[in-house]
């Protein structure tokens, strides 16, 4: 068996492979060895029997999209059946205390790897055997405690493997350079040790995105916005846009980014080195919001002048199909699509990302106030409560609710929550009443809002005791 | 939706060259490669070479390598197909198409340029 | 290079009747096989890809089969609009290679 009969559904084009040349890993047209890594076609009984206990999970993700040229990096991570977990020694324990369908058991161990390598490892103390390859027959490689390294991660992508042995989390990253743009697919397969071969447990594949366009996101904020996802704002208040760009691997940590905005009100182009900007809408409506952001990142370098005619034919497909930025570039012969550009050529080119969004304006709370507390004068029979009258005052449309919370004096722990519908005359002028248990200080936080808009102001008063002699007290 | 639209006939001495554009729309011009195919008259297809527009990578078939260049206007999206020293046999009609993704089949061509050699 | 042989250079099939055509490749190219439709005076049309698989649009009377280096394009029921020359082609390595054609006539 070959490598694409294992892996993947159907075998991929050597066009494929030609096309898309991941440094470090090997074509798929290679030889599987099947006696040490037995293949199972899904539905296959013996995957019931794979593992101990149920069967195992592997989670396959990426920090897709892309940017071509920049690194992708895929994790694999293998979930166990209840109660099981891989100890430091690498072998797989029940947890403690932990109950499972087969109840607690006695021995500790599901895989007591450890065990098996000191028992079974007659290797004149090299650590090299003939079980302890890859499928393709490579050896393992031998960093300090490999032998605490159980699974083999075979990952599988654009008619290409790449094998690795781990623990029961694996990390790979790939340089997209020589990706082609879109949707792609990696494939992974997971086998365990089993005394001299190995055994499948898991089969996992997921979607990865390599794009020339910078993916770019934009949040939005606004205060006294009461939806910061609707994408509707209030006019005359500043909304403050922060964009965001995908790049997990700072493949653009050393590029100048500018940003190009457009705010769909007739106020020009702003261009800014800056993430983030403020803009004001001050007429309701719905605008067309666009930004450009653009970066000279590292590229491919245009080709070069083609040389002068030869009068004999030349081999063909004379092409540059390995990476640019390779750290170990293998003689062109390798290769049926040999190196015609010098590898460490340091090109750039602009790339560009987009954002676009349709942003409504609409008339908002834009400001609230305090302007007056009164301590109201309570009936005797309760002493030990206090009534207090604050006057407000808005700008902006008219609220339909108002809601006081009062907390302690540190604003952090809420003691009394309470909201109304409010009916309020165009003067935006409004009184609200509360009641306050006991004296000392309180943090009171009032909110207005309508449909559209929450507008805050907070201050701290002071209730003092109540005193038979001094019955009306003004708050500060 | 995808197009290509080549340049038109071409009448040409023997040992002269001539230059076929087929300019793209509809789809990211940068994310596909372009192939150039030939046909003479009443005979089969014949594939050219090929070039990515993202990074002007070329492949040419053997027979075409020294003769052919191909080259791209990514401001203008179009691509071009330079055939030089022509000789009689250069004569026929010659296509753009387009890979998809990974796949070097063609569901997208161009209409075809006739080129003619003759003295 | 991968040679393809296509057979046979024609063929005249009654309407409504299968029409057959056989294409040979000099190395295993599995699954990586196209065929084209193509009439006078316009480029070729594709009609299947990766051997099997029909490309959108294309009536289901056309059908591929075949791996390795044996594979067959199938018109279950010849109707008039398919008189064309067919090629196929290899998209498995380059340089692309494609058939010298087969002329389906009717009879």
């Known amino acids: 068996k070959r490598f694409h009969d294992v892996l993947g559904n159907e075998r991929p084009s050597a066009y494929m492979r030609e096309h898309n040349q991941l440094n470090g890993w090997s074509s798929d047209e290679n030889d599987w060895n099947e006696k040490l890594y037995p293949v199972w076609k899904r539905g296959d009984m013996r995957w019931k029997n794979s593992w101990k206990g149920g069967r195992v999970q592997a989670v396959l993700t990426s920090d897709s999209p892309a940017l071509v040229g920049s690194n992708i990096t895929f994790a694999v991570n293998l979930i166990f059946p209840r109660c099981q977990k891989e100890d430091a020694n690498g072998n797989i324990v029940y947890e403690k205390n932990c109950r499972n369908e087969a109840g607690l058991s006695a021995d500790p161990y599901v895989y007591n790897w450890t065990a098996w390598s000191e028992d079974s490892d007659g290797e004149n103390g090299t650590g090299q055997s003939h079980h302890n390859v890859f499928p393709d027959g490579k050896p393992f490689p031998h960093h300090p405690g490999w032998r605490r390294w159980n699974f083999i991660y075979v990952f599988h992508t654009l008619g290409q493997y790449f094998q690795k042995l781990g623990r029961c989390s694996v990390r790979v990253s790939v340089n997209t350079a020589n990706v082609t743009l879109g949707p792609q697919l990696m494939e992974v397969t997971v086998y365990r040790r089993h005394g001299r071969a190995y055994v499948p447990i898991a089969q996992v594949k997921d979607v990865y995105v390599v794009t020339d366009q910078i993916p770019v996101f934009v949040t939005m904020f606004q205060k006294n916005d009461r939806n910061s996802s609707d994408e509707t704002f209030l006019k005359d208040l500043p909304i403050m846009f922060d964009v965001l760009i995908h790049d997990p691997s700072h493949f653009l940590n050393y590029s100048t980014i500018n940003y190009k905005w457009s705010f769909g009100d007739n106020t020009g182009l702003f261009v800014s080195t800056n993430h983030t900007v403020n803009h004001t809408y001050v007429l309701n409506g719905t605008f067309s919001l666009n930004l450009t952001v653009k970066a000279a990142a590292p590229g491919p370098c245009p080709p070069p002048p083609p040389p002068p005619r030869p009068s004999k034919p030349t081999p063909s497909l004379a092409t540059t199909l390995k990476s640019y930025d390779s750290n170990t570039p293998g003689p062109a012969g390798d290769n049926p699509l040999e190196l015609s550009r010098i590898p460490d050529e340091n090109c750039q080119i602009n790339r560009y990302g987009h954002f676009q969004a349709t942003i409504t304006i609409v008339e908002g709370i834009l400001e609230v106030n305090i302007i007056q507390m009164t301590d109201v004068l309570m009936p005797v029979p309760w002493p030990e409560s206090s009534l207090i009258d604050f006057v407000v005052t808005c700008q902006g449309s008219i609220p339909t609710e108002v809601c006081t919370i009062i907390s302690d004096p540190t604003c952090e722990i809420t003691q009394n929550t309470v909201c109304s519908p409010v009916d309020v005359d165009e003067m935006c002028l409004l009184t609200v009443r509360r009641t306050f248990n006991g004296s000392g200080t309180y943090c009171v936080n009032l909110t207005l809002g309508d449909d559209t808009s929450l507008a805050l102001t907070s201050t701290l008063i002071s209730v003092p005791d109540r005193d038979p002699a001094s019955p009306l007290r003004m708050a500060n | 939706q995808v197009q290509l639209v080549q340049s038109g006939a071409e009448v040409k001495k023997p040992g002269a060259s001539v230059k076929v554009s087929c300019k793209a729309s509809g789809y990211t011009f940068t994310s596909y490669w372009m192939h150039w195919v030939r046909q003479a008259p009443g005979q089969g297809l014949e594939w050219m070479g090929e070039?990515?527009?993202?990074?002007?990578?070329?492949n040419y078939a053997q027979k075409f390598q020294g003769r052919v260049t191909m080259t791209v206007d990514k401001s203008t999206s179009t691509v071009y197909m330079e055939l030089s020293s022509l000789r009689s046999e250069d004569t026929a009609v010659y296509y753009c198409a387009r890979s998809t993704g990974n796949y070097a089949w063609f569901a997208y061509w161009g209409q075809g340029t006739l080129v003619t050699v003759s003295s | 290079d991968i040679v393809m042989t296509q057979s046979p250079d024609s063929l005249a099939v009654s309407l409504g009747e299968r029409a057959t055509i056989n294409c040979k490749t000099s190395?295993?190219?599995?699954?990586?096989l196209a065929w084209y439709q193509q009439k006078p005076g316009q480029p070729p049309k594709l009609l299947i890809y990766s051997a099997s698989k029909r490309y959108t649009g294309v009536p289901d009377r056309f059908s591929g089969s075949g791996s390795g280096t044996d594979f067959t394009l199938t018109i279950s029921s010849l109707q008039a609009e398919d008189v064309a020359v067919y090629y196929c082609q290899q998209h498995y390595s380059i340089p692309l290679t494609f058939g010298g054609g087969t002329k389906v006539e009717i009879k």
């Open positions: 070039i990515n527009p993202y990074d002007q990578r070329t």
């Open positions: 190395q295993d190219v599995s699954p990586s």
